[in-house]
Interface confidence: medium
């Protein structure tokens, strides 16, 4: 059982310093910005992290959204990352959900965050270049320090 | 800057009912969760409550679940806390807490003291 | 319900001592703790969140560490402001819980 607490706006970096956003095709992308740019890409690099108590203590659940023209939410389903057109809901009766992930921060690295998802155990939100996109995939966990598991996540509030 | 200012407290008896309010200044108070904490004379903290920012979750600490009801006024930025059946060992400092990201009462108010007796 | 056991209660120490409290969750909070500082009469203040990351404008002779169950506060060179009460918070379940606290008394 997942009951959603409160919301934060956040900008949401890998380690290259590279900003997450949602382009006009829906996918959430990796891309050089300056604060300027981050700004003039508003919504699109703005989103918004909805925390939710869990009550099998895991840690702090969270599902990620957007709101362009309508909200949209991160979803894992089939261990493929892509944005639903949906609010994440207040509560959500089940242990897992394709839309919960778990954002923890990685030890030693204060400032580092990471997110496992709560449906696929071992798999985390992660930065994989393809071709010459950077793309927010889902990525099993397979060695300690992997950099494309790691984020950054400033609060906008 | 961003402000809690609790109010409401005094003495009441055992059995008795109060409701204690925080008024919230300095934030986007739709967009945050917050908590009731309490200090009773002389003793440590105690978490007691919290509901979410647009109020359709609450949760309460044993000690008080089905005497105590958060709830909270996004119109008037406003957050109270009805307090029935109270028993002496309610008596403390009462606190309302704004949490940060990652979960740490990062804003707190001063405080306003209940006293249980007869 | 996972319960917190904070040690010790209370210590005595001299300016620039080093001092160590810690806190044991009943079960893992992963590293969903925060410890505060509370002055008499006064609301507590945040010092440390996530286990180990520093809150801002606090001074870095504070440290935390741990995860899982066992946590620990470090003060490394304890000074006269530092006299105070400290309390750890787990947030990692449904319901949030304080250990009993830890008094800081001088010597």
């Known amino acids: 059982y997942f009951g959603k607490l409160e919301s934060k706006l956040s900008i949401i970096r890998n380690l290259n310093d590279q900003v997450l956003f949602i382009d006009q095709g829906n996918r959430p992308l990796f891309e050089d910005m300056t604060d300027s740019d981050c700004r003039d890409n508003a919504p699109r690099t703005i989103f918004i992290i909805n925390m939710y108590k869990d009550s099998q203590p895991r840690g702090m659940a969270v599902a990620i959204s957007v709101k362009c023209e309508k909200i949209s939410t991160l979803s894992c389903e089939n261990r493929i990352i892509s944005f639903k057109e949906m609010n994440p809901p207040d509560n959500i009766k089940d242990t897992k959900s394709d839309i919960i992930f778990f954002q923890r921060s990685v030890p030693g690295h204060d400032n580092k965050m990471q997110f496992e998802s709560s449906s696929y155990e071992g798999y985390f939100l992660a930065c994989e270049k393809e071709r010459d996109l950077y793309k927010l995939i889902l990525k099993k966990k397979d060695e300690l320090g992997d950099r494309s598991i790691m984020f950054t996540v400033q609060n906008e509030d | 800057q961003v402000q809690l200012l609790e109010s409401g407290g005094g003495l009441v008896q055992p059995g008795g009912s109060l409701r204690l309010s925080c008024a919230a200044s300095g934030f986007t108070f739709s967009s945050y969760a917050i908590h009731w904490v309490r200090q009773a004379p002389g003793k440590g903290l105690e978490w007691v409550s919290v509901?979410?920012?647009?109020?359709?979750?609450?949760y309460y600490a044993d000690s008080v679940k089905g005497r105590f009801t958060i709830s909270r006024d996004n119109s008037k930025n406003t957050l109270y806390l009805q307090m029935n059946s109270l028993r002496a060992e309610d008596t403390a400092v009462y606190y309302c807490?704004?949490?940060?990201?990652?979960?740490?009462?990062?804003?707190w108010g001063q405080g306003t003291l209940v006293t249980v007796s007869s | 319900d996972i319960q917190m056991t904070q040690s010790p209660s209370s210590l005595s120490a001299s300016v620039g001592d080093r001092v160590t409290i810690t806190c044991r969750a009943s079960q893992s909070i992963f590293n969903y703790l925060n410890w505060y500082q509370q002055k008499p009469g006064k609301a507590p203040k945040l010092l440390i969140y996530d286990s180990s990351t520093l809150q801002s404008g606090v001074p870095s002779r504070f440290s935390g560490s741990g995860s899982g169950t066992d946590f620990t506060l470090t003060i490394s060179s304890l000074q006269p402001e530092d006299f105070a009460t400290y309390y750890c918070l787990q947030y990692s379940g449904f319901l949030f819980t304080f250990g009993q606290g830890t008094k800081v008394e001088i010597k």
């Open positions: 509901i979410s920012g647009e109020g359709s979750n609450t």
């Open positions: 807490a704004r949490v940060m990201i990652g979960y740490g009462f990062d804003y």
